[in-house]
């Protein structure tokens, strides 16, 4: 009879996380008696996965009964498969011996590659708030795929964006892989409903795409734009005073009324008009006595926004018997959201 | 159902020679290592002889020269050719089929009795 | 050849009770050892391979363990039909050997 052969058939089997995974093995002959054992990997440090003598092994069944003399299909499922579970399987014949059965043939080995689906990606944004105009860097991750190749984008608002440096990690063999990106993002004054996605394509999605998103909301600083106006005379010794506060974000806002340099009033901006592209508006009123005043007087309207420092506008009302409507539209810079009307 | 059911047995001379014979049913008799195990009256148990599937023998000290195992696979038969028989060689004789993966015996025959004297 | 040396030879016990009988082997034997049970009258019957596996329809009760030259056969609860004669076999070598047996009687 001709010496026994272990057979492995499969040069390499893909098996998807979490189900199980078949590794195919049989002899040639039923003799030398003595058992079969599986190991992971080849060499001194190999991994003992399955011996049919003896030992526990919760994960493996067999696909025929192996306490049989009679059989020679030494095959075995592992289930429950993870990416820790890749390397090359071989099914070795032992020959009964003592103190140790003595190791007789192997097969050729099995490789056993997992495709392990990729975590939802995470996407994170800039530590602080930046102002429209300014450049700002995106990161996602995903972790625990297999295999290594992987296909990442970023898109602004559906649009494709160009501007990114991606990395996979290991560069090496390894059982799971980890993509890490960064995108450049430039602000505009219309970004706070704008969304930033990070998507990503592996062969385990089966052409279904995973998605992380960033809300720019979270990332822009809108400063407001300010306007300060003298309307017409609303009592004989009275002047009504508006500062509008236009198109900032985010809401955090307090406004502070100074004359000729002293504290009026300050309030916070509560009540706030909501712009189309997200911003908010806000106006605030001030009931000047003209009569309390011989000279003329300087009115600020200094606003505060989202703990920046303070931008302002003034007006000069003249003091005269008549009093006129006077304006300034000078805008000032800042970042803010919310509104409401003081009076 | 799988049995093995052992004859030949006899009343036999010193220096005679017999013939036991095992008939095995109810499994694949050639994929498996077969044996002869032998009981003296009020002793134990003594292994006989063993042949493989692809033919190799096998025998103790005791029986070495005498005895011969043999097997007709396309019978389901199992052989034990006896050869100058002793007293020493009265027994219970049973075949017993090596039925596990390590070759050690799962099933065994009724046995059949050899008794040799003048 | 590989001596194979039961203890005790015999043995007394009552229904219920829990007994263990021993098997040494003169040299390494690996765990290629099995346990069998005989009646008289009656063939041997294989109770457990490879040291510790029972064989297909062996109630639980009996148990085997050891390794390399010390072995050991249990009977968790006695019952009428456990009393019998126990061989130990080793067939890690040609000649295949057994112990000379453990006869258990009933108290």
């Known amino acids: 009879e001709e010496e026994l052969q272990v057979i492995q058939p499969d040069k390499s089997v893909l098996v998807a996380a979490g189900e199980t995974a078949t590794l195919r093995c049989t002899a040639t002959s039923l003799i030398p008696v003595g058992p079969i054992q599986w190991f992971r990997g080849a060499g001194p440090g190999r991994e003992l996965i399955y011996n049919q003598k003896e030992g526990h092994f919760p994960r493996v069944t067999t696909v025929s009964d192996l306490t049989k003399r009679n059989n020679m299909d030494f095959s075995i499922r592992i289930g429950n498969i993870t990416p820790a579970d890749a390397g090359t399987y071989y099914c070795v014949k032992f020959r009964k011996g003592s103190p140790d059965d003595v190791e007789f043939k192997s097969g050729a080995g099995t490789e056993l590659s997992v495709r392990a689906k990729p975590s939802a990606p995470v996407v994170s944004g800039p530590a602080a708030r930046a102002t429209p105009q300014h450049t700002v860097s995106f990161t996602c991750e995903s972790h625990g795929f297999s295999p290594r190749d992987i296909t990442l984008k970023w898109f602004k608002n559906g649009n494709e964006l160009s501007d990114f440096q991606t990395n996979v990690d290991p560069v090496g063999e390894s059982v799971s892989y980890s993509i890490h990106s960064t995108a450049k993002v430039v602000l505009t004054r219309e970004d706070v409903h704008s969304q930033v996605i990070c998507e990503v394509a592996h062969v385990t999605l089966q052409g279904d795409p995973l998605r992380g998103t960033a809300n720019l909301s979270e990332t822009i600083r809108v400063p407001p734009t300010l306007e300060v106006t003298q309307q017409p005379v609303r009592a004989e010794n009275q002047v009504n005073v508006t500062c509008q506060v236009r198109k900032f974000y985010p809401q955090r806002l307090q406004l502070t009324w100074l004359e000729n340099g002293n504290v009026s009033r300050t309030e916070t901006a509560s009540t706030v008009t909501e712009n189309k592209d997200g911003t908010y508006n806000w106006m605030s009123w001030l009931l000047v006595n003209v009569s309390a005043h011989r000279d003329d007087v300087k009115l600020t309207c200094q606003v505060e926004h989202d703990g920046q420092p303070a931008v302002s506008k003034s007006h000069d009302l003249k003091v005269s018997a008549h009093p006129k409507e006077q304006g300034s539209n000078t805008a000032a810079e800042n970042t803010g959201s919310n509104e409401r009307n003081i009076y | 159902e799988v049995q093995l059911v052992e004859s030949g047995g006899d009343l036999i001379q010193p220096g005679g020679s017999l013939r036991l014979s095992c008939a095995a049913s109810g499994f694949s008799f050639s994929s498996y290592d077969m044996h002869w195990v032998r009981q003296t009256t009020g002793k134990g148990l003594e292994w006989v002889s063993a042949i493989g599937t692809a033919g190799d023998t096998y025998y103790p000290g005791s029986v070495k020269g005498r005895f011969t195992i043999s097997r007709e696979n396309a019978k389901n038969s199992l052989y034990l050719q006896m050869n100058s028989l002793r007293a020493g060689d009265t027994a219970v004789y049973y075949c017993?089929?090596?039925?596990?993966?390590?070759?050690?015996?799962?099933?065994w025959g009724q046995g059949t009795v050899v008794t040799v004297s003048s | 050849d590989i001596q194979m040396t039961q203890s005790p030879s015999s043995l007394s016990a009552s229904v219920g009770d829990r007994v263990t009988i021993t098997c040494r082997a003169s040299q390494d034997i690996n765990n290629y050892l099995a346990w069998f049970q005989q009646k008289p009258g009656r063939a041997p019957k294989s109770l457990i391979f490879?040291?510790?596996r029972l064989q297909s329809g062996v109630p639980s009760k009996f148990s085997g363990s050891g390794s390399g030259t010390d072995f050991s056969l249990t009977i968790s609860s006695l019952q009428p039909e456990d009393f019998a004669t126990y061989y130990c076999q080793q067939y890690t070598f040609y000649p295949y050997t057994f112990g000379q047996g453990t006869k258990l009687e009933i108290k």
């Open positions: 017993a089929r090596g039925g596990n993966w390590d070759d050690a015996f799962d099933i």
């Open positions: 490879t040291a510790s």
